[in-house]
Amino acid sequence: KEEQISFRDCAEVFKSGHTTNGIYTLTFPNSTEEIKAYCDMEAGGGGWTIIQRREDGSVDFQRTWKEYKVGFGNPSGEYWLGNEFVSQLTNQQRYVLKIHLKDWEGNEAYSLYEHFYLSSEELNYRIHLKGLTGTAGKISSISQPGNDFSTKDGDNDKCICKCSQMLTGGWWFDACGPSNLNGMYYPQRQNTNKFNGIKWYYWKGSGYSLKATTMMIRPADF
């Protein structure tokens, strides 16, 4: 009888010999619960677990706390992998986070954090980041120190406003802060002077809504 192999992340998938981009079934740490994720096996050596993707506006990202917890969308297109899985995974070992961005003029940039993890749900999936490098700005567009995650029905930001309702989407809002990759998707020629678009301030500045974004993680010792 063939032994059932389970993978915690795309790095393990890659190391097992599966080196083709695509959707793979991953297993929660210390559990039999499964989740489908897209694995990028080509970029920067491969083994990347995609935890977020925006590319065409086909998926609504103004979702509830529960939806951001368990994930939504389609791993082959626009999706959010799920805060609970990412939290559990990134607390098992050290992970890096790479954020890849595209603007509407054909430019690409990235931000790489050498250490990334999310706190538990009890701590509102607070983001923790260290060691920024990359081409998408010398200053982190995710506010430091990291903030709690907020959604339209879970207001944990540092503003006595409701950032998730004002700027749309779930994110680690400050008050409200220089980034939101889960904002409203605006098509070309409608993507400037937007309050609530897909923003990475320290790359594109005020009011610019990006064309595409990918957030991906990989063990630091890969």
Epitope: C159, I160, C163, M166, D174, A175, C176, G177, P178, S206
Partner: antibody, heavy 129, light 109 residues
């Protein structure tokens, strides 16, 4: 922690000017408006105006136009309120208070009227001959 | 300019419910904020955007706003709630903040 610390009490003569400072700490100074509110003895709160520390833009209450000047020094995260041509009825406690600018990174010129979530301890200004 | 009217004083026994009103023309169309000020201290925000509470403010404090009246409600009143309470709105026509005249809440002993 987040706090606003104001300068000490002042005693001034009528016709003089007073400049009160408000030092911010524990947050992104540029991302919050700074307001000035005064309270005469036994009276209510009176809004004087705000400054946007990011741009330096100001909005003064009509009553104080021409007499009040609000400035800031972002390098030391400090806001200032100067009131000139003082009269005896300017005797009051002067407070600074911040309110968030949630659109700071989208459009620095757009004012969002959020409540004042943190206040300074107040500065007593006495105008007397 | 926009005017907010508050009763000068409200008295309530401990454990009872206090209601402080703030009147203004069509105030229901505006966001109302409420501040508590104890003697010799700076004001503290207790309710914002009509009915939301900042972190650290007890659930006993709540707010509502419709028509021409906004109301701050303090349930199960305690002696420590004795203070002046001010309502506040942004008057978009003048681009000015406006405070009500304040209400002194007395907790009867």
């Amino acid at each position: 922690q987040v706090q606003l610390v104001q300068s000490g009490a002042e005693v001034k003569k009528p016709g003089a000017s007073v400049k009160v400072s408000c030092k911010a700490s524990g947050y992104n100074f540029a991302g919050y408006y700074m307001h000035w509110v005064r309270q005469a003895p036994g009276q209510g709160l009176e809004w004087m105006g705000w400054i946007n520390p990011n741009s330096g833009g100001t909005n003064y209450a009509q009553k104080f136009q021409g007499r009040v000047t609000m400035t800031r020094d972002t390098s030391i995260s400090t806001a200032y309120m100067e009131l000139s041509r003082l009269r005896s009825d300017d005797t009051a406690v002067y407070y600074c208070a911040r309110s968030p600018n949630p659109y700071y990174y989208e459009s620095p010129g757009y004012y969002y009227p959020a409540a004042f979530d943190i206040w300074g301890q107040g500065t007593m200004v006495t105008v007397s001959s | 300019s926009y005017v907010l009217t508050q009763p000068p004083s409200v008295s309530v026994a401990p454990g009872q419910t206090a209601r402080i009103t703030c009147g203004g023309n069509n105030i229901g169309s505006k966001s109302v904020h409420w501040y508590q000020q104890k003697p010799g201290q700076a004001p503290v925000l207790v309710v914002y955007d009509d009915s939301d509470r900042p972190s650290g403010i007890p659930e006993r404090f709540s707010g509502s706003n419709s028509g021409n009246t906004a109301t701050l409600t303090i349930s199960r009143v305690e002696a420590g709630d004795e203070a002046d309470y001010y309502c506040q709105v942004w008057d978009s026509s003048s681009d000015h903040w406006v405070f009500g005249g304040g209400t002194k809440l007395t907790v009867l002993s």
